[in-house]
């Protein structure tokens, strides 16, 4: 009995659902009563899901797996794994027994995009040429371990005096902290690039240091020039700093975070104390750092509706303010591909290929191409619908006339994360059925 699975690993984003494809060729007269299907972890042989005695025996794997019962009779033994975790990574064996038996193993590669790096300087004020400064680049909640690269404003790699550490949290996701020590010139730009080797996703940030003394009197309020990019459901830090004068005390401080456009109050500190969140109880200051001039705001469990500009207003004797933009993003799931019609296909037939990718933000860019990489632009219709959370489901439909055989690829790009999710379907032979039965 021939059991077929994809050669390439299935790449799944943490928190999304993954389909581990597996198919077999049922003989004429085959009935599900004859089928014995077992999914198990290849290394430990731990049972994951099974079908026996004519019925689905259910998930033995944290209740997060499901078969496709309506497709089993046609030989589709694929397994749906929900809410993928880092711990799910590895090899899964699909074992099929009817009269004969066969098995094949499919690899699941788990991935999570790294957040846009945040950059911090130490020391961060009164910098002069010749000073040694420590630049820390931090990127959060990615998987697998990242590759980190530093370069100067001219693109020249900086490899000396770099220390990078990666720590996994309880979910197995990595927080990356890379430290570069440099001696300041008259001014300089330092860029940090955090690469996810599986997703081929690059997240980068840079800091430009112009050593100088702040003019006295004014409250210089500094925020990042680039938007802060935050993944839906994660926490974001909106960085804001000011330069406290000698003798400054928190009793003098009036700090207000508000939405730039509507002036709606988000969070405040006055009368020497944190007045708390006025924004759905999802914001917090860094109280231990305020006296040093760190007025940053932590925004928890980011939602699409949070996207926009936030103003950090600081008043001591004088006042100053600056606005920081929050750009919300959510990675798109690996596209699922469907064919209509999906059986008895012959060259010359017109077929509709639908590529669907879910729960991303902002709206995606969708590209189709053939097996040679030639873009397919004609007869493509793409629709994007936002759900209640503001996340988009993308459905792109390509109508093609079949040749003798052909591969059709769909690429769904998240323009903010620069994350590409792709799916493809290969249609060969004549006549044929999709999914392939053998």
């Amino acid at each position: 009995l021939e059991v077929q699975v994809p050669e390439d690993p299935v790449v799944a984003l943490v928190g999304t659902d993954a389909t581990l494809c597996c198919s077999f060729s049922p003989e004429p007269g085959f009935s599900l009563a004859q089928l014995n299907l077992i999914w198990q972890l290849t290394d430990t042989k731990q049972l994951v899901h099974s079908f026996a005695e004519g019925q689905d025996q259910g998930s033995a794997y944290a209740n997060r797996t499901a078969l496709f019962p309506d497709l089993l009779a046609q030989g589709n033994a694929s397994l749906r794994l929900q809410r993928v975790r880092v711990a799910d990574e590895g090899s899964f064996t699909c074992f099929v027994s009817i009269r004969d038996f066969g098995s094949a193993a499919v690899s699941l590669q788990v991935a999570a995009p790294y957040s846009k790096p945040s950059m911090t300087l130490e020391p961060n004020k009164d910098l002069r040429p010749g000073d040694t400064v420590t630049i820390t680049c931090s990127s959060y909640q990615g998987y697998p371990e990242a590759e980190v690269f530093w370069q100067d404003g001219q693109g020249v790699p900086l490899t000396g005096n770099v220390t990078t550490s990666q720590m996994a949290n309880e979910q197995g996701l990595f927080d990356v902290h890379s430290i570069l020590r440099v001696v300041l010139g008259a001014n300089g730009t330092y860029s940090c690039l955090v690469r996810n080797p599986v997703l081929q996703q690059d997240a980068h940030s840079s800091v430009t240091i112009t050593p100088q003394r702040s003019p006295t009197g004014a409250v210089e309020v500094q925020v990042p020039e680039d938007p802060v990019v935050a993944l839906v459901g994660t926490d974001a830090t909106l960085r804001c700093s000011f330069s406290p004068e000698p003798g400054f005390s928190l009793a003098q401080l009036n700090l207000i975070w508000q939405l730039t456009d509507t002036k709606q109050l988000v969070h405040s500190f006055t009368e020497g104390r944190d007045q708390g969140s006025a924004y759905a109880n999802r914001t917090a200051l860094f109280p231990d750092l305020l006296a040093q001039g760190n007025a940053s705001l932590r925004l928890q469990r980011v939602r699409v509706a949070d996207e926009g500009s936030f103003t950090c207003f600081v008043s001591i004797r004088d006042f100053g303010s600056a606005a920081v933009s929050l750009q919300v993003a959510a990675p798109y799931s690996k596209p699922s591909m469907t064919l209509e019609p999906n059986k008895d296909l012959r060259p010359g037939d017109t077929v509709t290929i639908t590529c669907s990718s879910y729960r991303g933000y902002p709206e995606a860019e969708v590209f189709w191409q053939d097996g040679q990489g030639v873009p397919l632009t004609g007869n493509v219709t793409t629709s994007q619908m936002a759900n209640e959370q503001g996340l988009f489901d993308v459905h792109s439909v390509l109508r093609v006339v079949l040749g003798a055989n052909g591969t059709y690829s769909c690429l769904v790009r998240n323009p903010v994360l620069q994350q590409d999710a792709h799916g493809s379907v290969t249609i060969t032979g004549q006549p044929m059925t999709f999914p392939p039965e053998a």
């Epitope: 009197g217 004014a218 009036n254 405040s268 004797r317 004088d318 600056a322």
Partner: antibody, heavy 119, light 108 residues
């Protein structure tokens, strides 16, 4: 002694422009934020524009946004209000004021300069 | 922007009376409030800052109180020179820091 002296007011036609100046003395001008407050005849007070000590941050009342510009020259100890696209409702006495330390109000005011917008 | 509502808009009283003027903010302004006195043809004069603190040279018959959204200016015993228009102004949040519409205090 802190002194604020406004100048530049006068009669201007609707749609016209005018620049008010405020000469400051008796304090370190470059260390304080400054504001312009106006009062239409028989009406209340309205804070029109404010600027911080180095001129890097400015704010405006919605009624003048896009038409008025507040600026300062710390070397000359002078505050300015450039007014353009003037309307009849901009007719008012314009006061120059010093922003005090956090929460301390506007303790110092100039004597005011009258701007009349009329055809 | 935060709205400041003063009441009453006008008030008649006699010398020696105790007078109270109130100011209500459209949201919590955390005691970031000042009171001014203005006489005809003159610039306003600061009386009270940070809701309760008397400005330099202001007689002790003036006092300020309140917190959150509700604030009060009290003159314990009216003197002839106190007949004027009074304004409140908040200093909370980003400018423009708005004024109340004013209370005209007249001789009865």
């Amino acid at each position: 002694e802190v002194q604020l002296v406004e100048s530049g007011g006068g009669l201007v036609q609707p749609g016209g422009s005018l620049r008010l100046s405020c000469a400051a003395s008796g304090f370190t001008f470059s260390s304080y934020g400054m504001s312009w407050v106006r009062q239409a005849p028989g009406k209340g007070l309205e804070l029109v524009a404010t600027i911080n000590s180095n001129g890097g941050t400015t704010y405006y009342a919605d009624s003048v946004k896009g038409r008025f510009t507040i600026s300062r020259d710390n070397a000359k100890n002078t505050l300015y209000l450039q007014m353009s696209s003037l309307r009849a409702e901009d007719t008012a006495v314009y006061y120059c004021t010093r922003n005090e330390e956090f929460r301390r109000g506007l303790a110092y005011w100039g004597q005011g300069t009258l701007v009349t917008v009329s055809s | 922007d935060i709205q400041m509502t003063q009441s009453p808009s006008s008030l008649s009283a006699s010398v020696g009376d105790r007078v109270t003027i109130t100011c209500r903010a459209s949201e919590n302004i955390y005691s970031n409030l000042a009171w001014y006195q203005q006489k005809p043809g003159k610039a306003p004069k600061l009386l009270v800052y940070a809701a309760t603190n008397l400005a330099d040279g202001v007689p002790s018959r003036f006092s300020g109180s309140g917190s959150g959204t509700d604030y009060t200016l009290t003159i314990s015993s009216l003197q002839p020179e106190d007949f004027a228009t009074y304004y409140c102004q908040h200093f909370w949040g980003t400018p423009p820091w708005t004024f109340g519409q004013g209370t005209k205090l007249e001789i009865k």
